[in-house]
């Protein structure tokens, strides 16, 4: 049989067929974060578990030093959830003191770094004001979308405040990507 | 033509090619929940609509008795949204009474059950403190990620309080999975 | 080699194999919205950037006049995030004034329109009461799920209040779909 017979009749096969099980994929899970230096105006990056428990990397998708390395150009679905938890936000304390009640916030950014380009690209951002009444609060921010990435691109997850990230359970805070 | 010509030149075809339309897939939608017994420390599982409206199961992915049955080993993207709604949480009542204001919470867990292993595995958790000022509140929790599953695994969605789940619309509360 | 050797032995290849890079895909990003007329009881639709920055459409998936056009029948993963921001909701003002504290809300709906039928079908809804204490609030609603779509179907994103949508950054508010 000619290969053409596998393809829908209305189109040319202009990209190679490939086995789905061979595509680059990763699901990373949270670990306790070690305080690290970061630039004043740049959110710190999380580091991740890549092989224990539910975490894995496969088919040349590698994790190193807070980055997921993209081994092959193509369209990827990228996702992350970060669960934050804290004590009463300053917002309500400020409010009680009669000062202007600017809310605190929590933010997650999925960032792409390309070696040939100095400035990181923000792919996805989830940001939320936190102005809780209760003394202890917790909540997740979930992000996910599709992006065209190039071989050699690096992905990371940045957060507004690393000390608020819930690192207690692998199902609460995670980061993943897979080639479509 | 040799089959090799369908594969990218840099790799071996070590998994079979397969038609995408043939992959196990399911999207389940909410139904009114019937109160059921559940263990004291275990969140109750939701049951689902699997064939009316927007719901479907296909290609040997079956739904039975609150579980999605995984028919084939591989990497699956699994997702769920649960919309919760309720009256003012106890948190604000407690606060008004001057007692320590421990917040209420809402939680969704996507759980994997493997027959050969007694303990369920929590794959994804979304949990949020609820300390609302308004008398009626409502909000969704969304989860989604990729996991390596084995043939015979079963997936379910558990919630912290089944009575708070909004079952009024199929687009508000749902659960799905598809083989990548 | 016979084509059959590419397929798992337990199944017939009843759908054509096709190159993944050839599948319809789109990721649209937010632009400043121009006020438009909409029916009283229908949420307004957002319009989108489809080719600048992170936005793209490919493989016959086209964007036109607020709609993503589905070029081919099949199962699609559809997603959107809308970030809302506003001043203190009326809810807390009402509360201070001692009137019944009905919460405001923010809602995102992903809607399918079929030419042969005037009534849209709501595929996904994320809805949240907003009853914030702080003077400025902001938060995202994320949605994503899989649906069977027909060639010619059109997708749009509707929101409860277009003036609350954060259009300042392409990573905060977006809409996408891809054929599985």
């Amino acid at each position: 049989l000619k290969g053409q017979e596998f393809a829908p009749s209305h189109q040319q096969v202009y990209a190679p067929l490939r086995a789905d099980g061979d595509k680059p994929r990763a699901h990373l899970t949270v670990v306790r974060q070690t305080p690290t230096q970061h630039f004043k105006n740049q959110f710190p990056a999380l580091h991740w578990e890549h092989e224990l428990g539910l975490a894995f990397t496969k088919n040349r998708m590698n994790y190193t030093n807070k980055f997921l390395l993209i081994p092959e150009s193509g369209d990827y679905f990228i996702y992350s959830q970060v669960t934050f938890r804290g004590m009463t936000s300053e917002c309500s304390e400020i409010r009680q003191a009669g000062r202007p009640n600017k809310p605190d916030s929590i933010t997650v950014v999925i960032t792409k770094v390309t070696d040939s380009y100095p400035e990181p690209t923000q792919l996805l951002m989830g940001t939320k004001s936190v102005c809780e009444v209760g003394s202890n609060w917790f909540q997740p921010i979930y992000l996910g979308a599709m992006f065209s990435l190039q071989e050699g691109d690096k992905l990371m997850v940045n957060v507004s405040d690393i000390s608020l990230v819930d690192y207690t359970k692998e199902d609460k805070t995670f980061f993943g990507a897979f080639l479509l | 033509l040799k089959g090799q010509e369908f594969a990218p030149s840099h790799q071996q075809v070590y998994a079979p090619l397969r038609a995408d339309g043939d992959k196990p897939r399911a999207h389940l939608t909410v139904v009114r929940q019937t109160p059921t017994q559940h263990f004291k420390n275990q969140f109750p599982a939701l049951h689902w609509e699997h064939e009316l409206g927007l719901a479907f199961t296909k290609n040997r992915m079956n739904y039975t008795n609150k579980f999605l049955l995984i028919p084939e080993s591989g990497d699956y993207f699994i997702y769920s949204q649960v919309t919760f709604r309720g009256m003012t949480s106890e948190c604000s009542e407690i606060r008004q009474a001057g007692r320590p204001n421990k917040p209420d919470s809402i939680t969704v867990v996507i759980t994997k059950v493997t027959d050969s292993y007694p303990e369920p595995t929590q794959l994804l958790m979304g949990t949020k403190s609820v300390c609302e000022v308004g008398s009626n509140w409502f909000q969704p929790i969304y989860l989604g990620a990729m996991f390596s599953l084995q043939e015979g695994d079963k997936l379910m969605v558990n919630v912290s309080d089944i009575s708070l789940v909004d079952y009024t619309k199929e687009d508000k509360t749902f659960f799905g999975a598809f083989l990548l | 080699l016979k084509g059959q050797e590419f397929a798992p032995s337990h199944q017939q290849v009843y759908a054509p194999l096709r190159a993944d890079g050839d599948k319809p895909r789109a990721h649209l990003t937010v632009v400043r919205q121009t006020p438009t007329q909409h029916f009283k009881n229908q949420f307004p639709a957002l319009h989108w950037e489809h080719e600048l920055g992170l936005a793209f459409t490919k493989n016959r998936m086209n964007y036109t006049n607020k709609f993503l056009l589905i070029p081919e029948s099949g199962d699609y993963f559809i997603y959107s995030q809308v970030t809302f921001r506003g001043m203190t909701s009326e809810c807390s003002e009402i509360r201070q004034a001692g009137r019944p504290n009905k919460p405001d809300s923010i809602t995102v709906v992903i809607t399918k329109v079929t030419d042969s039928y005037p009534e849209p079908t709501q595929l996904l809804m994320g809805t949240k009461s907003v009853c914030e204490v702080g003077s400025n609030w902001f938060q995202p609603i994320y949605l994503g799920a899989m649906f069977s779509l027909q060639e010619g179907d059109k997708l749009m994103v509707n929101v409860s209040d277009i003036s609350l949508v954060d259009y300042t950054k392409e990573d905060k508010t977006f809409f996408g779909a891809f054929l599985l």
């Epitope: - | 909410v30 009114r32 009024t168 | 069977s148």
Partner: antibody, heavy 124, light 107 residues
Framework: QVQLVQSGAEVKKPGASVKVSCKAS????????ISWVRQAPGQGLEWMGW????????HYAQKLQGRVTMTTDTSTRTAYMELRSLRSDDTAVYYC?????????????????WGQGTTVTVSS | EIVLTQSPATLSLSPGERATLSCRAS??????LAWYQQKPGQAPRLLIY???NRATGIPARFSGSGSGTDFTLTISSLEPEDFAVYYC?????????FGQGTKVEIK
């Protein structure tokens, strides 16, 4: 407006097959299931089966299992019911009906739109 | 399969009278029960869905009640056009099934 239009009357010999069509208009065909119901002369309604144009799922009445096949063509918005190995007691008016579903976990709806009926006569 | 039993088989009443039709299921169908009206030579018409919800365009004199195994269709004051055969149908589990029908005839 919402309507279902069925194919015309059929006269068949025992052992033959019949295929009745039901063309939908005025609504999103893929979203709502289609049931087929028959009514023998002077008898009550008998539910034959259901198909979802959205996902292809089918359910058939036990007594017709193996003899009936329901299909849909979403491109022409048409549902089909084929009954094989016809017998004289299959003589009936055959109806297609839209299964309304309100998109709510609280409701199952009902058959809210019916075709005009197709008379099938099985006689040697 | 779930068996639905309707009673009475025939109900003879005059216009203006109240009609009460019963439908009993062999096992619980929750509230997933519909009622249909059929006149000679016509297709059936949906009256009530989910036990108690009137379908679009159905007059207020038609009402449904019940849940579990016992259901009632009530016509508060019979109009001449209401004389017909009424069927209940369960939609709780496959296969859907109909009752055998109740004929409401003019006395």
């Amino acid at each position: 407006q919402v309507q279902l239009v069925q194919s015309g009357a059929e006269v068949k010999k025992p052992g033959a097959s019949v295929k009745v069509s039901c063309k939908a208009s005025g609504y999103d065909f893929t979203y709502y299931g289609i049931s087929w119901v028959r009514q023998a002369p002077g008898q009550g309604l008998e539910w034959m089966g259901w198909i979802s144009p959205y996902n292809g799922n089918t359910h058939y009445a036990q007594k017709l299992q193996g003899r009936v096949t329901m299909t849909t063509d979403t491109s022409t918005r048409t549902a089909y019911m084929e009954l094989r190995s016809l017998r004289s007691d299959d003589t009936a008016v055959y109806y297609c009906a839209r299964e309304n579903y309100y998109g709510s976990g609280a409701y199952r709806g009902g058959m809210d739109v019916w075709g005009q009926g197709t008379t099938v006569t099985v006689s040697s | 399969e779930i068996v639905l039993t309707q009673s009475p088989a025939t109900l003879s009443l005059s216009p203006g009278e109240r009609a009460t039709l019963s439908c009993r299921a062999s096992q619980s169908v929750s509230s997933y029960l519909a009622w249909y009206q059929q006149k000679p030579g016509q297709a059936p018409r949906l009256l009530i869905y989910d036990a108690s919800n009137r379908a679009t365009g159905i007059p207020a004199r038609f009402s449904g009640s019940g849940s579990g195994t016992d259901f009632t269709l009530t016509i508060s004051s019979l109009e001449p056009e209401d004389f017909a055969v009424y069927y209940c149908q369960q939609r709780s589990s496959w296969p859907w099934t109909f009752g055998q029908g109740t004929k409401v005839e003019i006395k």
